[in-house]
Amino acid sequence: MDGSGEQPRGGGPTSSEQIMKTGALLLQGFIQDRAGRMGGEAPELALDPVPQDASTKKLSECLKRIGDELDSNMELQRMIAAVDTDSPREVFFRVAADMFSDGNFNWGRVVALFYFASKLVLKALCTKVPELIRTIMGWTLDFLRERLLGWIQDQGGWDGLLSYFGTPTWQTVTIFVAGVLTASLTIWKKMG
């Protein structure tokens, strides 16, 4: 990982700014999609639509597919339902930090972070706290930039996600993602 903190010239797929822009687009699209599937019209989620290029569209489709699979994991849903959202920032950062506490980074965990953020957003919608939505997106992007950005750069940018989940065994990887998030939530409950 380059320690210079400088942005690579030309804003290619591994530049800090490009990774953050794409990450923001993916997160926004993922959350809007999850909310839409709940059937709830959420004007709070009507964030500025940004045209997606073919690569980002592919990535979005990949995230949707994983999200659907995670939605059907009952154990994970039960754990998320039990999350106390009285102090959502504390919960978010503790669970996020725990997911990566062993220093091992992989795309499954990045997706687990997005999925957890989407679930917190949906809870905010259900409890009529719409102002939390942009806030949760902000927390997710902050964590992404400070903890995951260097690793994503090392993978050649977001396109590495497609090859990670582009195998015939992507369902197996999704089970792993659910396991990571469930474990982090379990630890958080014990600590909380």
């Epitope: 990982m1 320690g3 903190g5 942005q7 800090s16 700014e17 953050m20 822009k21 923001a24 920032r89 504390e90 978010f92 950062f93 930090a97 990566f100 506490s101 220093g103 942009r134 806030t135 997106m137 902000g138 927390w139 992007l141 902050d142 930039r145 400070e146 903890r147 950005l149 260097g150």
Partner: antibody, heavy 117, light 110 residues
């Protein structure tokens, strides 16, 4: 070249207000995070507040919550720290810094804030 | 809140000495720990990020490591320009702080 320049410090009476500015160049603050860190005379570093302008995430230390407000104008590539109800214990050199990979990689030169009657 | 307890608070050493400064986190933290050097009247300078990554332009005599909740900055062979105050820093939201600094270690000439 990445650069951060603070301004706005000075002498103010207890209960007074000041607004500090942090002008950034060489990078876009929209996709970054800007922090204010202060250092009282002869003391260590204390994190004060931070902002991530893209979604407007803001964070504050308990010691300044409700009194200080961090903001940013991305069109000017500048972050601000509005300090109200100032106390003697707020006297310090205030630095703005950019974070990258969880570390503060670029710092300004600092601006001195003195709260005294 | 996560506390970063830095030790020692000061130390005296000679040029060429190996110097070790430790920061202990009060609870399990991620590897988002950084080390800075500060000289009087100047802004801090980043030395190490992500616990053990050497920042660009920093001499290789500086290194960082992690063992559980203990984070260590080592200067393998102290140089005249290394006499300064060193701070550790942790990133990660904890109740009231996004960033937490250690109390600092002043490295003086013996």
């Amino acid at each position: 070249e990445v650069q951060l320049v603070e301004s706005g410090g000075g002498l103010v009476q207890p209960g007074g207000s000041l607004r500090l500015s942090c002008a950034a160049s060489g990078f876009n603050i929209s996709y970054s995070s800007i922090h204010w860190v202060r250092q009282a005379p002869g003391k260590g570093l204390e994190w004060v507040a931070s902002i991530s302008p893209y979604y407007g995430s803001t964070y504050y230390a308990d010691s300044v919550k409700g009194r200080f407000t961090i903001s940013a104008d991305t069109s000017k590539n500048t972050a601000y720290l509005q300090m109200n109800s100032l106390r003697a214990e707020d006297t310090a050199v205030y630095y703005c810094a950019r974070s990258h990979f969880g570390a503060l990689d670029y710092w300004g030169q600092g601006t001195l804030v003195t709260v005294s009657s | 809140d996560i506390q970063m307890t830095q030790s020692p608070s000061s130390l005296s050493a000679s040029v060429g000495d190996r110097v070790t400064i430790t920061c202990r986190a009060s609870q399990s933290v991620s590897s988002a720990v950084a080390w800075y050097q500060q000289k009087p009247g100047k802004a801090p300078k980043l030395l190490i990020y992500s616990a053990s990554s050497l920042y660009s332009g920093v001499p290789s005599r500086f290194s960082g490591s992690r063992s559980g909740t203990d984070f260590t900055l080592t200067i393998s062979s102290l140089q005249p320009e290394d006499f300064a105050t060193y701070y550790c820093q942790q990133w990660g939201y904890s109740h009231s702080h996004l960033i937490t600094f250690g109390q600092g270690t002043k490295v003086e000439i013996k």
